[in-house]
């Protein structure tokens, strides 16, 4: 049909911080490159209907659906979504094409569905259909990378079976310990799947996609390093590949390396060797032990021996299922207001855990550090001396673990008082929970030393209310004390605080706060 206009449908994705995205459905200023959505004529449909390619959007993403119409004369339009008509304001671009835009800000489930655009031009009427859905991130996965030997080459391939396809990078470091932290200048990153330089001190492979980043370290025994006090331990699940690198440096090439499992030499095809000269003409040899898919019988002590170095071993444990081993009993701590203190959890886990610390329904990042004995530790110090319940939560593919901590801050009671016609009440939020005394101030006792015991009702909190321990004491008014000043005092191991109350008539009372340490 020659009367049909040339139509182009595009999708523009906005970065979340893009201030150019307006709230109306008129066109926003955009700099992102538009994605062509095709817009083909829909066959066998009554009337002229164009259908754009389906649009998948991440939750909270902002997008613009845009139609470019190459037709002479003016156009008028109407958007319809879920039986509601929406405002439509066409404009013309520099090429004199009609431009109609629909902005969707911060995509939600309710904004998913069919968007119909009805356009009326001088020549003809037609409809354009957009189908917008939320991308199902439930299908997304991010799997820990693993290693494979490259066919016919002395190189390692890093593989992560993840959706969407991850970016794979090698993270290399030639220093020891702390200086191999991610941000260190000693760290070199290579965004490629294959690694040929396998002689470095510390080799890790990382994979990242929308779900985050996962890394796997190449397990290494260095025969030139003093062995750890406890035997290094490597956990693997049945079916996973095993890779252990044995590395040794010697003044010349006159030495060899071998692998044994429980005193039996590894079969050929389960190891390969590489060697190179370093800058100072010493020889570096590495010998890889590998099993493409481990079974339970691959468990045992793997020993790397050298003709010129003391041998070293690692215990490889093959498990059916991942685990997190730690004590989950809740722990209560009492600290002073300015005391330095950190919560800590010591655990052994495989695969590596993801963890969070939570306080007052806020989550905090969780750092974990490996200890020499095969355990890891996570500490949380950012409590800012706020009392309450702190939760450590860890999980991996196969296990979950939660541990509760309670933090109480020792402090002197603060006393607040209130009186009515029939009673006077004092409240305190000190910790440990305070004890109470009431004293009467009179001519006989100007220093308020005459203790009141009648009509006093003390109560310590039997639970926290809104995270706060509250203790209270109430004095029921009797004729004997009406018109007198009385003093309520709360005391605990950190000190005493008092308030003086004039018992006369209901209404606002003059309170005098005494702070006695």
């Amino acid at each position: 049909n020659q009367d049909l206009p040339v139509i182009k449908c595009v999708l523009i994705n906005h970065k979340n911080n893009d201030s150019s995205v307006g709230k109306s459905s008129s066109y926003p200023m955009v700099s992102e490159s538009p994605e062509d959505l095709g817009c083909a004529l829909r066959p066998q449909s009554s009337g002229t209907v164009y259908e754009a390619a389906a649009v998948e959007v991440d939750v909270s993403a902002s997008i613009t659906l845009q139609v470019l119409v190459d037709a002479p004369g003016n156009i008028s339009c109407l958007w319809v979504f879920k039986h509601s008509s929406l405002n439509c304001q066409p404009h013309f671009d520099l090429q004199n094409r009609g431009v109609v835009s629909m902005v969707i800000l911060k995509m939600t489930e309710t904004q998913a569905g069919e968007y119909l655009l009805f356009i009326q031009s001088e020549a003809t009427n037609y409809t354009i259909l957009f189908t917008v859905s939320i991308r199902n991130t439930l299908l997304y996965t991010l799997r820990r990378p693993y290693f494979r030997k490259m066919e016919n080459q002395d190189a390692l391939v890093c593989i992560s079976e993840s959706v969407p396809e991850p970016i794979v990078e090698w993270v290399l470091c030639d220093s020891q310990g702390e200086s191999c932290k991610e941000e260190s200048p000693a760290v070199v990153k290579k965004e490629e799947k294959v690694l040929h330089e396998l002689f470095g001190t510390d080799i890790r492979c990382c994979a990242r996609n929308e779900l985050g980043r996962e890394c796997t370290r190449l397990f290494t025994i260095d025969l030139n390093q003093t062995p750890q006090t406890t035997l290094p331990q490597l956990f693997l699940k049945v079916g996973e590949p095993l890779w252990i690198r044995c590395k040794a440096v010697h003044v010349n090439h006159g030495f060899g390396l071998t692998w044994e499992l429980e005193n039996k030499a590894l079969e050929e095809g389960n190891y390969f060797e590489m060697s190179t000269y370093s800058t100072n003409r010493t020889m570096i040899r590495i010998l890889f032990a590998f099993v493409s898919s481990v079974a339970r019988n691959d468990t045992g002590y793997y020993t790397c021996s050298s003709s010129k170095h003391p041998s070293q071993s690692a215990l490889v444990t093959i498990v059916e299922k991942g685990f997190i081993n730690a004590t989950n009993s809740s722990e209560d701590y009492e600290i002073d207001q300015y005391e330095e203190f950190c919560f800590s959890v010591r655990f052994k886990a495989y695969p590596q855990i993801r963890c969070t610390w939570t306080f007052s329904r806020k989550s905090f990042p969780c750092e974990q550090k490996g200890l020499d004995n095969g355990y890891s530790i996570s500490k949380f110090c950012n409590h800012k001396h706020q009392p309450g319940e702190y939760i450590f939560h860890a999980e991996n593919d196969d296990a979950q673990f939660t541990k509760m901590f309670t933090l109480n801050i020792r402090r002197k009671p603060q006393v607040l008082a209130e009186a009515s016609a029939s009673q006077a009440s004092c409240f305190s939020d000190g910790y440990p929970l305070p004890s109470w005394t009431w004293k009467k101030c009179s001519d006989k006792s100007p220093n308020c030393t005459e203790e009141i015991t009648e009509g006093v009702w003390n109560r310590k909190a039997n639970r926290k209310v809104f995270g706060q321990w509250v203790s209270s004491s109430t004095l029921n008014m009797s004729e004997a004390i009406k018109g007198f000043l009385v003093k309520c005092c709360a005391y605990n191991s950190l000190g005493t605080s008092c308030e003086t109350i004039l018992l006369n008539s209901p209404g606002p009372f003059p309170f005098i706060q005494d702070n006695i340490s």
Epitope: L416, E418, S425, R459, A461, F466, G467, S472
Partner: antibody
């Protein structure tokens, strides 16, 4: 026995804020913790947060964090709940309720409720 | 947060019959800090039971509560005409305090 009297019904536009008051009489206001609970038409009860007036300590349900502010004025024995960035799904009856924290008052359960304030959010 | 699930959703009974309402928690309710409320149309809720089994002031003894941990029950031994209403359980042992979705007790 403490009585709680709430402010009157409100009609609000989406995006605006509402502030509901709850005045206590017939008891010692500071001896209580005040909670705010809402009930959408035909729905169940939902705890929004609360305050211990004598200590001024407020606590909020995660769902409302950042949108709700609960305050109390001990001199007038009044608690307030302000909800901002209103949307149509905030249309509900808002109740204040109290539980005792001192004296011979129990520490448990809301033994006194306000009459409720209907907040309608509509454009 | 602790999720409370009440069952059944609706209970159809005649006056004089016994009503048993259940409230199950997604995790243990500390110190049995669980309350039961009654609500009639157009009215604010009314406290019946606190601490899982203690009757509030002025509540008739036909109302009783029991249970601990994750399973709690409200029993009305003989239904009176004024007992037909919606009943809610609420835990106040850990914040956020949460309510069950309610059980409607209606006349059969």
């Amino acid at each position: 026995q403490v009585q709680l009297v709430q402010s009157g019904a409100e009609v609000k536009k989406p995006g605006s804020s509402v502030k509901v008051s709850c005045k206590a009489s017939g008891g010692t206001f500071s001896s209580y913790a005040v909670s705010w609970v809402r009930q959408a038409p035909g729905q169940g009860l939902e705890w929004m947060g609360g305050i211990i007036p004598i200590f001024g300590i407020a606590n909020y349900a995660q769902k409302f964090q950042g949108r709700v502010t609960i305050t109390a004025d001990t001199s007038t024995s009044t608690a307030y709940m302000e909800l901002s960035s209103l949307r149509s799904e905030d249309t509900a009856v808002y109740y204040c309720a109290i539980e005792g924290i001192g004296g011979d008052l129990r520490y448990e359960g809301y033994d006194a409720w306000g009459q409720g304030t209907l907040v309608t959010v509509s454009s | 947060e602790i999720v409370l699930t009440q069952s059944p959703g609706t209970l159809s009974l005649s006056p004089g019959e016994r009503a048993t309402l259940s409230c199950r928690a997604s995790q243990s309710v500390s110190h049995s800090y669980l309350a039961w409320y009654q609500q009639k149309p157009g009215q604010a809720p009314r406290l019946l039971i606190y601490g899982a089994s203690f009757r509030a002031a002025g509540i008739p003894d036909r109302f009783s509560g029991s249970g601990s941990g994750t399973d709690f029950t409200l029993t009305i031994s003989r239904l009176e005409p004024e007992d037909f209403a919606v009943y809610y359980c609420q835990q106040y042992g850990s914040e956020p305090y949460t309510f069950g979705q309610g059980t409607k007790v209606e006349i059969k």
